[in-house]
């Protein structure tokens, strides 16, 4: 998930040279930007979140807000400061005319301004509930640990906290920030106001139909009786949680955001800050049958984003729409006809559908995992959720063709045992945003802060690409893929792993002069090869076929085309061992795969040769997939032969550590 490329509108209002009487001018050359929701009906013009630069203190935020008011007043405009943010993001929420945006963007400390917009509950039916008794024998599901050490925050509608399913499990906080209901004839019926939140609280921690039956919850009201809220209200809710966490630190926290709005830079930024403060955020992917990257908080990389599947593990259809999909989704979970507490009466149950329900399942699973292992980091939790998911059970034909490769084929499941996964080397695949079609376009895939980038590959549907390379950015390795002339764009694919005490570096060999191809190996003592990448400047790599098999005794070697530079990812970590596994097919084939065996984890996936008919390579779970152009276009020459190269690793150190614990 990337939060830098959502299809949202960015209006950069250039700073005028005269400073309009400001005491402090913004730093030279910086231009604050204005953002608004790309979905016009969801915009809320007249209310703006002014986000200040990261190190801005509360007193400076208040001073900047007052300055805006004073300068607006001099121009004859009334403004109202609705809230001053601190704790998560510095800034303030202001009600003002859009005419003042240019003025506001020139204020000192301003980083960007975002127009407020709507967010919505992600369940259907919202009001067509049917009362149903629970459909299963409750005693079939008795989890070993019900999440009792974890607190789950729910940002949703009001809830009926004394419903028999959740009574005593949910503490209703005094937080409320909701917009007025639409329509003059709207009748505020209590049971409808509570419907969405009550159901989700039941799915997370309900006595009889809940996932984490021991989890305690706290509810914040950010959605009104129509299931509608605002980005600003959600931000203030997230800030409330952060302040509560600081005032009274408790055990692990899970925040459930069963809502979605258009792409929002500020909402994603707030989620990132909260996640970096050690909070696990789980959100609905959205019910728009669309790319989840176009919605927030679903597009925030630090958030665990959940799509919805049904009892047959198929993507959920919701009327004419359905679950969102794409690279910003982490995994799917049950989200159709989910039984839970109904606010219609204190003992009623109802079925609801949507990505909200799916997210509630994952929040419950997360609570149970964290209760069993309270020290888990967000990265460790996400990797475990992925690891224990059911793989390759979703019918991908439901997704648009261009999204199938990007969408994870994973359905959340409870681990068979909440303990004992510590020995595993966990890895996941992270796809970048699409680079776009320009000649020099690149795409970047990043791992989470406490994950290691162990390999980097690229993929282009047209096959026109110039490979990929690992490079340092801000003290961390990233994976960058390069588009080629005439290409429709590329994706970078990072293999992100949990490898404690790892020391990784990239060794590069420039294009070889000799016809034998380019080679590079890990020459440092104790370093093992975890991934190979190749990058070339020429537009077309021709048909040169390097030797595929490595010389004996050279397992730590990457081999590539003589016109390409080759990059080896070399890592040293306690007990880390890796091996190269290849699968070559002499005849042309659209897809070649090679998988790591049980107990080994795929860290690297690449293709040999790197010629232009190879579309690219990527990891799907523990399998390396190499895709080539349609067989009919390549003919059956030897040029069509492709080898998939997997690097499989395991950590003896992790295995020993877990045995010592048991």
């Amino acid at each position: 998930q990337e939060d830098e490329d959502g299809d949202y509108e960015e209006l950069v209002l250039a700073l005028r040279s005269e400073e309009d009487g400001l005491a402090e001018a913004p730093e030279h050359g910086t231009t604050a930007t204005f953002h608004r929701c790309a979905k016009d009906p969801w915009r809320l013009p007249g209310t703006y979140v002014v986000v200040l630069k990261e190190e801005t203190h509360l007193s400076q935020s208040e001073r900047t807000a007052r300055r805006l008011q004073a300068q607006a007043a001099r121009r004859g405009y009334l403004t109202k400061i609705l809230h001053v943010f601190h704790g998560l993001l510095p800034g303030f929420l202001v009600k003002m005319s859009g005419d003042l945006l240019e003025l506001a963007l020139k204020l000192p400390h301003v980083d960007y301004i975002e127009e407020d917009s709507s967010v919505f509950a992600q369940s259907i039916p919202w009001n067509l509930e049917r009362i149903t008794p629970p459909r299963y024998r409750a005693d079939e599901y008795q989890p070993p640990d019900g999440g009792s050490l974890v607190e789950v925050y729910l940002l949703d509608t009001s809830i009926q906290s004394d419903h028999r399913e959740i009574e005593g499990r949910v503490m209703v906080t005094d937080f409320e920030n909701v917009p007025e209901e639409d329509g003059t004839r709207f009748h505020r019926q209590a049971s409808k106001c509570d419907s969405h939140g009550t159901h989700l609280a039941g799915v997370v921690s309900g006595r009889d139909a809940g996932v984490a039956k021991g989890a305690s919850m706290r509810s914040l009201r950010v959605l009104n009786c129509q299931g509608k809220g605002t980005v600003s209200g959600t931000l203030i809710g997230l800030e409330f949680i952060r302040k509560s966490q600081l005032v009274q630190p408790v055990g692990p926290l899970v925040v459930l955001l069963p809502l979605a709005g258009g792409y929002s830079r500020v909402l994603n930024a707030a989620c990132q800050r909260l996640a970096r403060a050690g909070v696990v955020l789980v959100t609905a992917a959205g019910n728009f049958r669309d790319d989840a990257c176009l919605y927030s908080p679903a597009s925030a990389p630090e958030v665990i984003t959940v799509g919805a599947t049904n009892a047959q593990d198929q993507p959920v259809t919701l009327g004419t729409l359905g679950t969102n999909f794409g690279r910003c989704v982490d995994l799917f979970a049950p989200g159709e006809d989910i039984i839970g507490a109904s606010s219609d009466c204190s003992t009623c149950f109802v079925s609801q559908s949507g990505t909200s329900q799916a997210a509630a399942h994952v929040a419950g699973i997360a609570a149970m995992m964290l209760s069993a292992e309270p020290e888990l980091t967000l990265a460790e939790l996400r990797q475990r959720l992925i690891h224990f998911s059911a793989k390759d059970v979703i019918n991908e034909a439901w997704f648009p063709e261009d999204q199938r490769v990007l969408t994870p084929n994973l359905v959340a499941a409870l681990p068979p045992s909440t303990h004992g996964a510590g020995w595993q080397l966990f890895c996941r695949t992270v796809w970048s945003a699409h680079s776009g079609p320009t000649r020099m376009a690149t795409a970047v895939a990043r791992c989470a802060p406490d994950e290691e980038l162990l390999s980097c590959s690229s993929f282009s549907r047209s096959g026109k690409r110039r490979g990929e390379r690992m490079e340092a950015q801000g003290g961390k390795l990233v994976c960058r893929a390069h588009n080629a002339f005439g290409g429709e764009g590329v994706y970078a694919i990072a293999r992100c792993c949990l490898l404690p005490q790892a020391n990784c570096s990239v060794h590069t060999a420039p294009p070889a002069e000799a016809s034998m191809g380019t080679r590079v190996h890990c020459h440092q003592q104790g370093h093992v090869l975890t991934g190979c990448s190749s990058h070339w400047e020429v537009e077309d790599l021709g048909t040169h076929k390097p030797p595929v098999l490595r010389p004996r005794g050279q397992p730590n070697q990457c081999v590539g085309h003589r016109e390409a530079s080759i990059h080896a990812s070399c890592c040293h970590a306690p007990g880390l061992e890796c091996k190269v596994k290849e699968h070559g097919i002499p005849a042309p084939q659209e897809q070649v795969t090679v998988a790591c065996e049980e107990g080994w984890t795929l860290t690297g996936c690449s293709a040999l040769p790197g010629t232009s008919h190879v579309l690219g390579a990527y990891a799907v779970d523990n399998t390396c997939v190499v895709r080539s152009r349609d067989v009919s276009t390549t003919g059956s020459t030897s040029e069509g032969a492709v080898t998939a190269v997997a690097i499989c690793c395991r950590s003896r150190h992790l295995a020993q550590a877990s045995q010592e614990l048991q």
């Epitope: 008794p133 629970p134 024998r137 409750a138 005693d139 008795q142 009926q160 906290s161 004394d162 028999r164 009574e167 005593g168 949910v170 503490m171 209703v172 209590a190 006595r207 009889d208 039956k213 009466c345 204190s346 003992t347």
Partner: antibody, heavy 115, light 109 residues
Framework: QVQLVQSGAEVKKPGASVKVSCKAS????????ISWVRQAPGQGLEWMGW????????NYAQKFQGRVTMTTDTSTSTAYMELRSLRSDDTAVYYC????????WGQGTTVTVSS | QSALTQPASVSGSPGQSITISCTGT?????????VSWYQQHPGKAPKRMIY???NRPSGVSNRFSGSKSGNTASLTISGLQAEDEADYYC?????????FGGGTKLTVL
Amino acid sequence: QVQLVQSGAEVKKPGASVKVSCKASGYSFTSYGISWVRQAPGQGLEWMGWVSAYNGNTNYAQKFQGRVTMTTDTSTSTAYMELRSLRSDDTAVYYCARGYVMDVWGQGTTVTVSS
Amino acid sequence: QSALTQPASVSGSPGQSITISCTGTSSDVGAYNSVSWYQQHPGKAPKRMIYEVSNRPSGVSNRFSGSKSGNTASLTISGLQAEDEADYYCSSYTSTNMVFGGGTKLTVL
């Protein structure tokens, strides 16, 4: 600490009504409903019904439907149970308990119905 | 709603273990996790000893444990002590209400 304190003993004539109160303290009153349970002399416990402190909704046992009214007053964190058309077999100790979970009980109110 | 079925009385000597059963149907005990057990001493209000089949509230001795199989729940008291002599009631959710067992008188010999 969490406490439920009930009103004192009552003696009523057949056909009359009785209203028992139950004052809650030590917790967020609207987070739980209040259950009412009675126990006739030498008999077991009998669940009468439940009232929501959140929205006033009620759930009565079929046996008492039409004869019982359960209410709450959030301003004083107090729940009330009124039983009408009393008969001699309504003589019992009436308990309030916190929620359906019934994790905390009042001390009980003895209601004697006698002519 | 008819009451859940409990034995009218059980007895045991100090230090022994006893088990009290509570039999319902697939619409109450069998359908829900919410089986509770209450202890009542003469002239006192009931006290919750076990909730949600097998959970013990804080302050309740670990000599008390609960379990469930199908439509029958059980309360086991190990290492019987004189102060355990009391009436014991089980309760369960039904689809719309709550139901109690008829009660079991435990005598410590």
